[in-house]
């Protein structure tokens, strides 16, 4: 997946620093207080959909083949989304106000692709 | 996830019949020749992003919190994408022209959500 570097408008991964204090989640998340979560942005021209590493590869590739031939679904926009996310350990208060440490999936965007 | 029924413009699953013959893939895919692969379409207003069943839940929820507060990344569109895909068995010619049967992931869109 591409890294956003200011020189491309194609689907890429933008570094993004998340601070739980800014969104008021520091009242239940103990650690980390912040981390690089990143996000995906950019355009998804037809040729980028369904390439290796793209989201839901087989299905995306099939739908893209339909689009390239001018067949339905032609109006659905291809979308720049996370294709690889990673897990991070988090220390937080659970529903019963116990402090717990858990591996939380889908916290960090590692790669982006066109769905 | 919502099913598209012609009455909603929100992110939903649209039934879609895929015929490999129409895209010229019948030269390597033996069976099935066609199937319901479906696709996702519709709008993703802010309140729909990061709800249970949406894509990449934790990360989506965090980014959505930033957006709701007018913080970056505010310009990135939320996107209606598959949140649940299923596997299907496929009989096809491999690289050495042997006929093989495999479970192919991500063939069928089962549910859609906002990323």
């Amino acid at each position: 997946g591409l890294e956003c570097d200011g020189r491309t408008n194609l689907c890429c991964r933008q570094q993004f620093f998340i601070d739980f204090r800014l969104i008021g989640w520091n009242d239940w998340i103990i650690a980390p207080t912040s981390y690089y979560g990143n996000y995906c942005e950019g355009s998804c021209p037809a040729y980028l959909a369904g390439v290796p590493g793209s989201a839901s590869s087989f299905h995306t590739a099939v739908v893209n083949q339909y689009r390239m031939r001018g067949l339905n679904p032609g109006t659905v926009n291809s979308c720049c989304i996370p294709t690889k996310l990673s897990t991070m350990s988090m220390l937080y208060f659970d529903d019963e106000y116990n402090i717990v440490k858990r591996d939380v999936p889908n916290m960090i965007v590692e790669e982006c692709g066109c769905a | 996830g919502l099913e598209c029924d012609g009455r909603t413009n929100l992110c939903c699953r649209q039934q879609f019949f895929i015929d490999f013959r129409l895209i010229g893939w019948n030269d390597w895919i033996i069976a099935p020749t066609s199937y319901y692969g479906n696709y996702c379409e519709g709008s993703c207003p802010a309140y729909l992003a990061g709800v249970p069943g949406s894509a990449s839940s934790f990360h989506t929820a965090v980014v959505n919190q930033y957006r709701m507060r007018g913080l970056n990344p505010g310009t990135v569109n939320s996107c209606c994408i598959p949140t649940k895909l299923s596997t299907m068995s496929m009989l096809y010619f491999d690289d050495e022209y042997n006929i093989v049967k495999r479970d192919v992931p991500n063939m069928i869109v089962e549910e859609c959500g906002c990323a």
Epitope: - | N26, I30, A31, T33, S89, M90, F93, I99, K101, D103
Partner: antibody, heavy 117, light 107 residues
Framework: QVQLVESGGGVVQPGRSLRLSCVAS????????IHWVRQAPGKGLEWVSV????????DYADSVKGRFTISRDNSKNTVYLEMKGLRAEDTALYYC??????????WGQGTLVTVSS | DIQMTQSPSSLSASVGDRVTITCRAS??????LSWYQQKPGKAPKFLIY???SIQSGAPSRFSGSGSGTDFTLTISSLQPEDFATYYC?????????FGQGTKLEIK
């Protein structure tokens, strides 16, 4: 309902030819793969050949490759097995069967081929 | 080619018995295994596919399990009409191959 009926079997001398037919009803052969499977007297099942959905792709067991040819006539909803250079070891009950992604979900009653001098 | 080996080759049992037939593949075939029942003078009948999915119309006393190389067909309570020969078959790759069969006889 789905039905497959084989015909064309009989007694034939070694080296001679025979053509088996498999007439389908209840479905169209152009939408399914059709296999031939044989069973020698008192023995197990042996896959012989298949003609796939598009009619272009065909496959054969090594034991019959170069001698047997599978074909299809969509207008007659029929699949054929042309058998040339028959040998004693080809003696068997020949079944046609409908494909279900490499499995066989419907079978005919079979037609007996006896190769004997 | 993938070799399929069934055991036992023959088996005697009584009505009401629980019976298990095994099938072993010479290499990993995931769960792409089917079972067929054949009665004397009749064509085989499709019973189970994908190792454990029961074919429409097959009695629920038949069940299948296994993946990789080792598979079993189980009849939970033998009925008089179940005495027949059973074949396993792999659909993982062509040529599609059968086991040699297991003949189930009345004790």
């Amino acid at each position: 309902q789905v039905q497959l009926v084989e015909s064309g079997g009989g007694v034939v001398q070694p080296g001679r030819s025979l053509r088996l037919s498999c007439v389908a009803s209840g479905f169209t052969v152009s939408s399914y793969g059709i296999h031939w499977v044989r069973q020698a007297p008192g023995k197990g099942l042996e896959w012989v050949s298949v003609i796939w959905y598009d009619g272009r792709n065909k496959d054969y067991a090594d034991s019959v490759k170069g001698r047997f040819t599978i074909s299809r006539d969509n207008s007659k909803n029929t699949v054929y097995l042309e058998m040339k250079g028959l040998r004693a070891e080809d003696t068997a009950l020949y079944y046609c069967a409908r494909d279900k992604t490499g499995d066989f979900d419907s079978w005919g009653q079979g037609t007996l081929v006896t190769v004997s001098s | 080619d993938i070799q399929m080996t069934q055991s036992p080759s023959s088996l005697s049992a009584s009505v009401g018995d629980r019976v298990t037939i095994t099938c072993r593949a010479s290499q990993n075939i995931n769960s792409f295994l089917s079972w067929y029942q054949q009665k004397p003078g009749k064509a085989p009948k499709f019973l189970i596919y994908d190792a454990s999915s029961i074919q429409s119309g097959a009695p629920s006393r038949f069940s299948g399990s296994g993946s990789g190389t080792d598979f079993t067909l189980t009849i939970s309570s033998l009925q008089p009409e179940d005495f027949a020969t059973y074949y396993c078959q792999q659909s993982y790759s062509s040529p599609f191959t059968f086991g040699q069969g297991t003949k189930l006889e009345i004790k």
